[in-house]
Interface confidence: medium
């Protein structure tokens, strides 16, 4: 396994007062094995609201690498392959749960954290505000 | 506290052999406060690849209820508001971490699980296979 310099202030696993703490088995079970692993990997190029993927890395977090989508254009790609600014490319965002080492560098102590990630983009009709 | 019929096979928190077990503080920290999480709540109706949300419930999982996106059409909505079958609505999928009570009914013992959820839909150009 990985060797993490242990923080001397790491909480004691046996401490019954360690706040809201539960035992979690990190042998992660993946329920997705029966799904067709046809990842939506090429959708980012084929979409009418294409996106680029940016790597976000944090060694104190699990998962340590998260790929974030950034829409390539403000508008959407039309049938001619041009950007149509009458439509909008918008990120589809999702909150995900991650584990953060807390205190930092403690190998067996984590806190659940909610972070907002952009998963991909979709093309939407804009909301037009009419000025009276 | 809560009355849960306790499973006699619940693991002992002090058991050093309990596989890959860590202490997790479940006071979920929200990293999203500095952003204005403009919830993408209306995109599912405004998208050219609109989607419906379907309820998936599992009482032994947290969160117990997950609403999954299902694309409304095979094709995409064109400028006239009709479905264009020359384009495809496809789901954007993302793996998320959930907690599962394991063994079931043990109040303080969980397993991390990865599940694949459909977050929304995007409109893509189809892959056309030409028959020789």
């Amino acid at each position: 396994g990985i060797t993490i310099p242990r923080n001397p202030g790491c909480p004691n696993s046996e401490d019954k007062n360690f706040p809201r703490t539960v035992m979690v088995n990190l042998n992660i079970h993946n329920r997705n094995t029966n799904t067709n692993p046809k990842r939506s990997s090429d959708y980012y190029n084929r979409s009418t609201s294409p996106w680029n993927l940016h790597r976000n890395e944090d060694p104190e977090r699990y998962p340590s690498v998260i790929w974030e989508a950034k829409c390539r254009h403000l508008g959407c790609i039309n049938a001619d392959g041009n950007v149509d600014y009458h439509m909008n490319s918008v990120p589809i965002q999702q909150e995900i749960l991650v584990l953060r080492r807390e205190p930092p560098h403690c190998p067996n102590s984590f806190r659940l954290e909610k972070i907002l990630v952009s998963v991909g983009c979709t093309c939407v009709t804009p909301i037009v505000h009419h000025v009276a | 506290g809560i009355t849960i019929p306790r499973n006699p096979g619940c693991p002992n928190s002090e058991d050093k052999n309990f596989p890959r077990t860590v202490m997790v503080n479940l006071n979920i920290h929200n990293r999203n406060t500095n952003t204005n999480p403009k919830r993408s709540s209306d995109y599912y109706n405004r998208s050219t690849s609109p989607w419906n949300l379907h309820r998936n419930e599992d009482p032994e999982r947290y969160p117990s209820v997950i609403w999954e996106a299902k694309c409304r059409h095979l094709g995409c909505i064109n400028a006239d508001g009709n479905v264009d079958y020359h384009m495809n609505s496809v789901p954007i999928q993302q793996e998320i971490l959930v907690l599962r009570r394991e063994p079931p009914h043990c109040p303080n013992s969980f397993r991390l699980e990865k599940i694949l959820v459909s977050v929304g839909c995007t409109c893509v150009t189809p892959i056309v296979h030409h028959v020789a």
Epitope: - | N30, E57, S64, W67, P107
Partner: antibody, heavy 126, light 107 residues
Framework: EVQLVQSGAEVKKPGESLKISCKAS????????ISWVRQAPGQGLEWMGG????????DYAQKFQGRVTITADESTTTAYMELSGLTSDDTAVYYC???????????????????WGQGTTVTVSS | EIVLTQSPDFQSVTPKEKVTITCRAS??????LHWYQQKPDQSPKLLIK???HSISGVPSRFSGSGSGTDFTLTINGLEAEDAGTYYC?????????FGPGTKVDIK
């Protein structure tokens, strides 16, 4: 459709204890949270505390700490709120309310009350 | 604890008029603010969650906006059935707190 049905009105004497029930039907009781909110006559809403059955967590407002106990029984899908050392200031309508704890449209849809019980009127008088 | 202040305390409004209720938090609460309506002798009812997200079954004339410390509930075209007290509610940190309420009545 989620429904929360509370126990009936109570009349208590100062110093006594009170235990109100909130029976839930519909939805995953284990997965959602139940909070208790009270409203004194002519006053606003006051959060007392809540429970998340999935984790067995309870949270209490400091004001009620030591005097309130919130419990839940998964087998009967019922939450309870017990308040001890009653005084006339505890005369109020007590509501249970559901915190959905759902993952909806990409977000953890939690920490608000989408369904409420009908309220239990409690009068504390000597 | 986070203190929520609402203004106005009371508003008397003619039907079809626009009503604006503001809620200010004593610290940044992101968008963890919700709005409830309570009619006399009834339980509160959720109107808006997360500052601006509409609730299924709630008329579209109700809308919410804001983030951080300043929030607004707007009723576009008040109807007679909208009479009642409106509360804002923060769930950013424990203890959860409610605003003191804004009573709306129909002229």
């Amino acid at each position: 459709e989620v429904q929360l049905v509370q126990s009936g009105a109570e009349v208590k004497k100062p110093g006594e204890s009170l235990k109100i029930s909130c029976k839930a039907s519909g939805g995953s009781f284990k997965g959602y949270g139940i909070s208790w909110v009270r409203q004194a006559p002519g006053q606003g809403l006051e959060w007392m505390g809540g429970i998340t059955p999935f984790f067995g967590w309870t949270d209490y407002a400091q004001k009620f700490q030591g005097r309130v106990t919130i419990t839940a029984d998964e087998s009967t899908t019922t939450a309870y709120m017990e308040l001890s050392g009653l005084t006339s200031d505890d005369t109020a309508v007590y509501y249970c309310a559901r915190d959905p704890n759902e993952f909806w449209n990409g977000y953890y849809d939690t920490h608000h009350f989408d369904y409420w019980g009908q309220g239990t009127t409690v009068t504390v008088s000597s | 604890e986070i203190v929520l202040t609402q203004s106005p305390d009371f508003q008397s409004v003619t039907p079809k008029e626009k009503v604006t209720i503001t809620c200010r938090a004593s610290q940044n609460i992101g968008s963890e603010l919700h709005w409830y309506q309570q009619k006399p002798d009834q339980s509160p009812k959720l109107l808006i969650k997360y500052a601006s997200h509409s609730i299924s079954g709630v008329p579209s004339r109700f809308s919410g906006s804001g983030s951080g410390t300043d929030f607004t509930l707007t009723i576009n075209g008040l109807e007679a059935e909208d009479a009642g007290t409106y509360y804002c509610h923060q769930t950013f940190s424990l203890p959860y707190t409610f605003g003191p309420g804004t009573k709306v009545d129909i002229k």
